[in-house]
Amino acid sequence: QAGPLPKPTLWAEPGSVISWGNSVTIWCQGTLEAREYRLDKEESPAPWDRQNPLEPKNKARFSIPSMTEDYAGRYRCYYRSPVGWSQPSDPLELVMTGAYSKPTLSALPSPLVTSGKSVTLLCQSRSPMDTFLLIKERAAHPLLHLRSEHGAQQHQAEFPMSPVTSVHGGTYRCFSSHGFSHYLLSHPSDPLELIVSGSLEDPRPSPTRSVSTAAGPEDQPLMPTGSVPHSGLRRHWE
């Protein structure tokens, strides 16, 4: 007796982070024996969509002609073969940008920093938000995000880096997100170029794991995870 059908592969083109109004195609690739493909979206009635396979039957295409908030979320796909339904694919998280106005990204004390010193990237939103993401151009994943606990919303998040090395240099942007959905992000901030001078080499630096602050207009430093409720932003390392 054959074992369970292998799970399909799920991906999005041109990528899984899509600006509002742009088109995106979700692909589900199974096996040549597939007769039907099903796409499920978390917290939506299943199936979210069904498609017949494209020749040679090992994959199906699910098209989103214009990205909106309704399409943002977590997807899984399945295929049906003569022996039944496959295991679910690994999840695909489809994120939409442009849900909110762009935050402001700055570097303290300056975007020009000497190797071995410290710098803090500050992402500020004029309205209260509960998640801030910092990304670096050409990095595979967000460097980190700061998410507020217990729904406490903040106007800013600080991303400290220490000690800085040449690898920290590059172009950064930040995004903010509201509590409605973590799959909806703001427009990206304007880019910030971090320029590192000096020669203290460290091949694999990372942002320092120090206490995060996310003061709003009050400028009250906030405590890390595990402290009093409503006390700030939880740091998620990617």
Partner: antibody, heavy 120, light 110 residues
């Protein structure tokens, strides 16, 4: 030319309603700005009414005194912002301005204003 | 709530005078403060943003300073065109605000 043009003002009786419009040109309301309404009663200072985020979700925030009676909305296809005002009172008599929050967090683009008079 | 308090409410001065207007926030607003000039019958005009940055086309006799809760607008040598009302404004947008503007300062001829 980048500008905001308000319309819809006029005379309205106490308890009545009015909808003001603000047409944007030279930039898109769906680009990364907030837009707000500000009013100024005769001989008085500037008073913020509320703001709407131009992001697709369209979050709105209102001054504490404006909640319930004032509603800000937008129609991206017409590149127009609206202010719906209900249960109007004599003290709502003012010039109403449509204003853009710039990248610098300041109010960098103002309409010419439209006068609303609430009187019987 | 963040409240903006401007002083003085009226200021009498002469052409050539150095004029200073103060704006105090009830809690820190970092440097997110702007100053506006308004003349009768006209919409306000942005003078200074981010506490100290001069808006495009604004004469250099205007300057701004401060951060946190205390801010000042200075006109180094008052000109005839400067007699107007001036307002400060903080840049935050929230649901617990009564207003984002200070009460205004009218600069009149002495």
């Amino acid at each position: 030319e980048v500008q905001l043009v308000e319309s819809g003002g006029g005379l309205v009786q106490p308890g009545g309603s009015l909808r003001l419009s603000c047409a944007a040109s030279g930039f898109s309301l769906s680009s990364s700005y907030w837009i707000c309404w500000v009013r100024q009663a005769p001989g008085k200072g500037l008073e913020w009414i509320g703001s709407i985020d131009s992001g697709s979700v369209g979050i709105t925030y209102y001054a504490t005194w404006a909640k319930g009676r004032f509603t800000i909305s937008r129609d991206n296809s017409k590149n127009t912002l609206y202010l719906q005002m209900n249960s109007l009172r004599a003290e709502d008599t003012a010039v109403y301005y449509c204003v853009r929050h710039g990248d610098n967090w300041a109010l960098d683009l103002w309409g010419q204003g439209t006068l609303v008079t609430v009187s019987s | 709530d963040i409240q903006m308090t401007q002083s003085p409410s009226t200021l009498s001065a002469s052409v050539g005078d150095r004029v200073t207007i103060t704006c105090r926030a009830s809690q820190s607003i970092n440097s997110w403060l702007a100053w506006y000039q308004q003349k009768p019958g006209k919409a306000p005009k942005l003078l200074i943003y981010k506490a100290s940055t001069l808006a495009s086309g604004v004469p250099s006799r205007f300057s701004g300073s401060g951060s946190g809760t205390e801010f000042t607008l200075t006109i180094s040598s008052l000109q005839p065109d400067d007699f107007a009302t001036y307002y400060c404004q903080h840049g935050y947008i929230r649901g617990d605000l009564d207003n984002v503007f200070g009460g205004g300062t009218k600069v009149e001829i002495k």
